[in-house]
């Protein structure tokens, strides 16, 4: 794959209601089975068809789950994270990190490579600066007419 791959990272609060087949997604990760090197985070590995998460539509494969009902998922064994979900109750609030791939060249699937990504302001600041420069140049041009 050519070009540098960067990730636009956004966070979202997703509230799911446990369905007949649970929350309807799979997880990987934990301190004992890192999904990404040097990152013990919990990642969504599969969205089950017609499950609670699929019907809600916001959770995606490759998303990192930061907390469950306000409880941090940092530095947990995989089974401890599973137990948190198991005991989370009927209404489950997830704090989720989405990663949107932005790169020069073909787009690969999410969930590979460096999970840290780039903060949204690092994309927005240059865009804002360019807009301001363009507006200034336009005003100068109009004054000369």
């Amino acid at each position: 794959m050519n070009g540098r791959v960067d990730y636009l990272v956004t966070e979202e609060e997703i509230n799911l209601t446990r369905g007949p087949s649970g929350l309807g997604f799979n997880i990987v990760g934990g301190t004992d089975q890192q999904y990404v090197s040097n990152d013990s985070g919990i990642y969504v590995s599969r969205i089950k068809e017609n499950g609670a998460a699929a019907l809600d539509g916001r959770l995606q494969e490759g998303d990192k789950i930061l907390s469950v009902n306000g409880q941090d998922l940092k530095n947990l064994l995989h089974q401890d994270a599973v137990d948190l979900f198991r005991n989370a109750g009927y209404a489950v609030s997830l704090r989720v990190q989405h990663r949107l791939q932005v790169q020069n060249g073909p787009i690969g699937h999410r969930g590979e490579g460096d999970p840290s990504g780039i903060p949204i302001f690092m994309v927005l600041v240059p865009v804002f600066a360019l807009t301001m420069v363009a507006a200034w140049a336009f005003m100068r041009y109009r004054q000369q007419l």
């Epitope: 087949s21 649970g22 929350l23 997880i27 890192q34 090197s37 969504v44 995989h78 490579g113």
Partner: nanobody
Framework: QVQLVESGGGLVQAGGSLRLSCAAS????????MGWYRQAPGKQRELVAS???????NYADSVKGRFTISRDNAKNAVYLQMNSLKPEDTTVYYC?????????????????WGRGTQVTVS
């Protein structure tokens, strides 16, 4: 449905090398863990090495420095390069595809197994 097909097993002398391959087909998803397990007669199946689609690897202590796991995400394949083989490495090696723990009623691992390939070190 997921299918895993192993190849590359065989008979080799102690100190020799083998390269096992496993090709996965079906709905394996983009986020998964592929690995190799082995099972000696009368013993439990044990992890040899695994690699995630995110690039993290894990090895059994007994094979560290001798075996190397790698994968080709585009081909949905995983490989195990086995060097400095010992007679105690003799057994059946199984390919495994793990799609994580399902947060449903059962909370079971969502995983699949190949039929196995025999490795014999004389």
């Amino acid at each position: 449905q997921v299918q895993l097909v192993e190849s590359g097993g065989g008979l080799v002398q102690a100190g020799g090398s083998l390269r096992l391959s496993c090709a996965a087909s079906g709905s394996i998803g983009s986020i998964n863990i592929m690995g190799w397990y082995r099972q000696a007669p009368g013993k439990q199946r044990e992890l040899v090495a695994s690699i995630t689609s995110g690039g993290a690897t894990n090895y059994a202590d007994s094979v560290k420095g001798r075996f190397t796991i790698s994968r080709d995400n585009a081909k949905n394949a995983v490989y195990l390069q086995m060097n400095s083989l010992k007679p105690e490495d003799t057994t059946v090696y199984y390919c495994n595809l793990d799609r994580g723990t399902h947060l449903g009623d059962s909370f079971e691992r969502d995983d699949y197994w190949g039929r196995g390939t025999q490795v014999t070190v004389s």
